[in-house]
């Protein structure tokens, strides 16, 4: 299941690429999959908001509750705050199966 | 029902090393779901979280800054139990400590505690 | 480090009143929020998390409200055995902070 995220979170960063006209030289923070989640990319003084993964939010519906966010910087990506262990309860994939 | 029993000294000396030791009943140090984490509680400093350990699939820590250089959560599976050791102390180590499970329901709680041990740092 | 403070820091009530304890986060911590009720010489044990949500055993007449930085713990109905300190604690961000306590004594 998490390959599958992790193929469909790559093919979502690849079209934002295309519509946003980002290229690796671009100013700004690429897409990436985290191990976790999917960040789409971002420009720099971006705040980037994602939920908790469905799997984990089955029981937390909270519109409040399991959002974990970064900002883009101009050294890249900031850490998640909250951090996943706080925000969703788990912080590995690999740790869940 | 879920227990927790402290042991360990109640008294330690300036620069030397606390050790606690929490005896978990009713669940298990492995238990995917919860995490092992110690507190301590004085007068001056109120309630203090000082760090967990837990297991998924393999074992983690976090501690809080102000003890990270000093603190060292060891799980111990065979007895099903883990332990707290905070070396250098001084006086203002001096505390009631206690151990705690903590669960997941939205957010991290600590849902079952142990009697607490009260230490102090001394000469 | 998230501060978290308590008011009243005590306040005296007789057996059926209403109490309101609020406790405020120095940031936003949307309803990672723990409220814990404390006798002297025991442990602090679990009432309310995430903000509202009442832990398995605990008497209807506790209630917890709020969301991001203001959050209140209420009584209904004061009973002798609810004469404690009462601690709020948040859990969005390491190390996970409490507030100073409300201690709730007789009239």
């Known amino acids: 299941i998490f390959k599958k995220e992790q193929a469909m979170c790559l093919e979502k960063i690849q079209r934002a690429n295309e519509l946003m006209g980002f290229n690796d030289s671009s100013p700004g923070c690429p897409g990436m999959w985290d191990n976790i989640t999917c960040w789409k990319p971002a420009h720099v003084g971006e705040m980037v908001l994602v939920s908790c993964p469905e799997l984990f939010r089955i029981f937390n519906p909270d519109q409040d509750m399991g959002v974990v966010s970064r900002n883009c910087t101009e050294d890249g990506w900031s850490e998640p705050f909250p951090h996943y262990f706080d925000a969703c309860g788990f912080d590995e994939y690999e740790s869940e199966t | 029902q879920v227990q927790l029993q402290q042991s360990g000294p109640g008294l330690v000396k300036p620069s030397q090393t606390l050790s606690l030791t929490c005896a978990i009943s009713?669940?298990?140090?492995?238990?995917?779901?919860?995490?092992w984490n110690w507190i301590r509680q004085s007068p001056s400093r109120g309630l203090e979280w000082l760090g967990r350990?837990?297991?998924?699939?393999?074992?983690?820590?976090h501690y809080a800054v102000s003890v990270k250089s000093r603190i060292t959560i060891n799980p111990d599976t065979s007895k099903s139990q883990f332990s707290l050791q905070l070396n250098s102390v001084t006086p203002e180590d001096t505390a009631v400590y206690y151990c705690?499970?903590?669960?997941?329901?939205?957010?991290?709680?600590?849902?079952?505690w142990g009697q607490g041990t009260l230490v102090t740092v001394s000469s | 480090d998230i501060q978290m403070t308590q008011s009243p820091s005590s306040l005296s009530a007789s057996v059926g009143d209403r109490i309101t304890i609020t406790c405020r986060a120095s940031?936003?911590?949307?309803?990672?929020l723990v409220w814990y009720q404390q006798k002297p010489g025991k442990a602090p044990k679990l009432l309310i998390y995430?903000?509202?949500m009442l832990q398995s055993g605990i008497p209807s007449r506790f209630s917890g409200s709020g969301s991001g930085t203001d959050f209140t713990l209420t009584i209904n109905s004061l009973q002798p055995e609810d004469f404690a300190t009462y601690f709020c604690?948040?859990?969005?961000?390491?190390?996970?902070?409490f507030g100073p306590g409300t201690k709730v004594d007789i009239k």
């Open positions: 009713g669940d298990s140090v492995s238990n995917k779901q919860a995490t």
């Open positions: 350990t837990y297991y998924r699939g393999k074992w983690k820590n």
């Open positions: 705690a499970r903590g669960m997941w329901n939205q957010n991290w709680f600590l849902d079952h």
């Open positions: 995430a903000a509202n």
């Open positions: 604690q948040q859990s969005i961000q390491q190390p996970y902070t």
């Open positions: 940031q936003k911590i949307a309803r990672y």
